[in-house]
């Protein structure tokens, strides 16, 4: 008789999840000399230990602590780029602007980017059929808790001027329920962070509005100001130029060297 398996509302674990995590770890440590000391098998064991045999609605930040310890990494605290609802452009940007870092440019963020995973209570199996959905099932699921944990740590590490890239095409340019709005904003350290500068990326060239005046941006400004951090916002009116420059950094009209 086949054993009953919990059906969750979200997609199951990404296929070849263990192999993917291990391969990404090896690739990352080869590319980043400062992380060459990392033992990728130990990283995978710690990752696995965070969710295997545990109820996928009962995961805690503590479960991920062994992984956090192994993945400890120092990035320049004044070169951090946060993002919300505009991941691809933020990643294209840091691939070119190599002295800036998103969470996904760190080892732990790189390992888990775009992946889904969960296990089952009391079995060592990975659930490839379904995993809990944050809204429909539970928020303390393996994926959500992982991103909450690494995002909190990433924000806590930031200093000086922190940048955040926001999507000006969305109805909520700043969304309190996003990882940025619910975790990162509240974990920037006022004693270290002087300013949060938002870059609002406009959707089209014809859009000449001041999206920094958007009510949700004002809400973000209020939250940040109450935390004794200065807030600054810039309209980025040329998404075409921005994209062109992040894709072709060697393009002569993209350089700020005069």
């Amino acid at each position: 008789v086949p054993r009953w398996r919990q059906q969750w509302s979200g997609p199951g674990t990404t296929k070849r999840f263990p192999e993917t995590v291990l391969a990404r770890c090896v690739k990352y440590t080869e590319i980043h000399p400062e992380m060459r000391h990392v033992d990728c098998q130990s990283v995978w064991d710690a990752f696995k230990g965070a969710f295997i045999s545990k109820h996928p609605c009962n995961i805690t930040e503590e479960d991920y602590q062994p992984l956090m310890k192994l993945g400890t990494q120092t990035v320049p605290c004044n070169k951090i780029l946060l993002w919300s609802r505009i991941k691809d452009l933020a990643h294209q940007f840091t691939q070119v602007q190599r002295d800036m870092f998103t969470l996904e440019d760190t080892l732990l963020g790189y390992l888990a980017d775009d992946l889904t995973w969960c296990g089952e209570f009391n079995t060592s199996k990975i659930n490839y059929q379904s995993c809990p959905d944050w809204r429909k099932d539970c928020s303390n699921n393996p994926v959500s808790v992982f991103w909450k944990t690494v995002s909190r740590r990433f924000a806590e590490a930031a200093c000086d001027v922190v940048h955040v890239m926001l999507n000006g095409s969305r109805s909520k340019i700043f969304d309190k329920n996003s990882t940025f709005g619910s975790v990162e904003v509240h974990n920037l350290q006022p004693e270290k962070v002087q300013t949060l500068e938002a870059w609002v990326i406009h959707g089209g060239r014809e859009d000449s509005r001041d999206l920094c005046q958007d009510p949700t941006i004002k809400e973000l400004e209020s939250i940040i100001s109450k935390r004794n951090i200065q807030f600054s916002c810039k309209n980025i009116y040329r998404p075409d130029k921005f994209l062109q420059c992040v894709k072709n950094p060697e393009d002569s009209s993209c350089t700020s060297e005069i």
Partner: antibody, heavy 123, light 105 residues
Framework: QVQLVESGGGLVQPGGSLRLSCAAS????????MNWVRQAPGKGLEWVSH??????????EYAASVKGRFTISRDNSKNTLYLQMNSLRAEDTAVYYC??????????????WGQGTLVTVSS | DIELTQPPSVSVAPGQTARISCSGD??????VSWYQQKPGQAPVLVIY???NRPSGIPERFSGSNSGNTATLTISGTQAEDEADYYC????????FGGGTKLTVL
């Protein structure tokens, strides 16, 4: 080094036409967006027109004051920027500068300018 | 479009600090560039992206931008700094301020 040299200015009657040229050298002309900026005698700078480069399909933009009357174009094989000015008015009298648009991911600015050519519209 | 307003003139004694303002509704939300223009000459870029100096521009030139005012600061002003100064921004179209005549007394 970067050089921009404007020509084609002169005296023209109201309603008349004129074509300005800007010869570029010292850089890969086709790789840059180009602009025309003007300055009326004793007055400030006013942006006139813009033409993007090849990978943005040579899109053009114009200030409201010249839209429908002026046409910007470029000939990359000749490293030359043009401004065709029709239906000229007295208020178009100005020194016209050709300017190269430089920039970063975030913003654009005019890093290099020509010396300008004077257009006088008068009867 | 955003309107940029500059004082028509600013005077400063040699060696002193000159500050030229460029005001506009929430100008801090836009990147600002500054140009220097001497009589009979073409403008020269002195500051871009609020506070960046092109190579060849003396360190005494600096820029800031927040709230409703962008400021060009010239520390230890020299006689050769006497010129017209223009601020410029972009919000889908290029906009220049009216210009400020800097006089070095």
């Amino acid at each position: 080094q970067v050089q921009l040299v404007e020509s084609g200015g002169g005296l023209v009657q109201p309603g008349g036409s004129l074509r300005l040229s800007c010869a570029a050298s010292g850089f890969t002309f086709s790789s840059y967006a180009m602009n025309w900026v003007r300055q009326a005698p004793g007055k400030g700078l006013e942006w006139v027109s813009h033409i993007r480069k090849k990978n943005t399909s040579y899109t053009t933009e114009y200030a409201a004051s010249v839209k429908g009357r002026f046409t910007i174009s470029r000939d990359n094989s000749k490293n030359t920027l043009y401004l065709q000015m029709n239906s000229l008015r007295a208020e178009d009298t100005a020194v016209y500068y050709c300017a190269r648009e430089d920039g970063s991911y975030m913003t654009d600015y005019f890093a290099y300018w020509g010396q300008g050519t004077l257009v006088t519209v008068s009867s | 479009d955003i309107e940029l307003t500059q004082p028509p003139s600013v005077s400063v004694a040699p060696g002193q600090t000159a500050r030229i303002s460029c005001s506009g509704d929430n100008i801090g939300h836009y990147y600002v560039s500054w140009y220097q223009q001497k009589p009979g000459q073409a403008p020269v870029l002195v500051i871009y992206s609020d506070s960046n100096r092109p190579s060849g521009i003396p360190e005494r030139f600096s820029g800031s931008n927040s709230g409703n005012t962008a400021t060009l600061t010239i520390s230890g002003t020299q006689a050769e700094d006497e010129a017209d100064y223009y601020c410029q921004s972009y919000n889908g179209t290029y906009v220049f301020g009216g210009g400020t005549k800097l006089t070095v007394l």
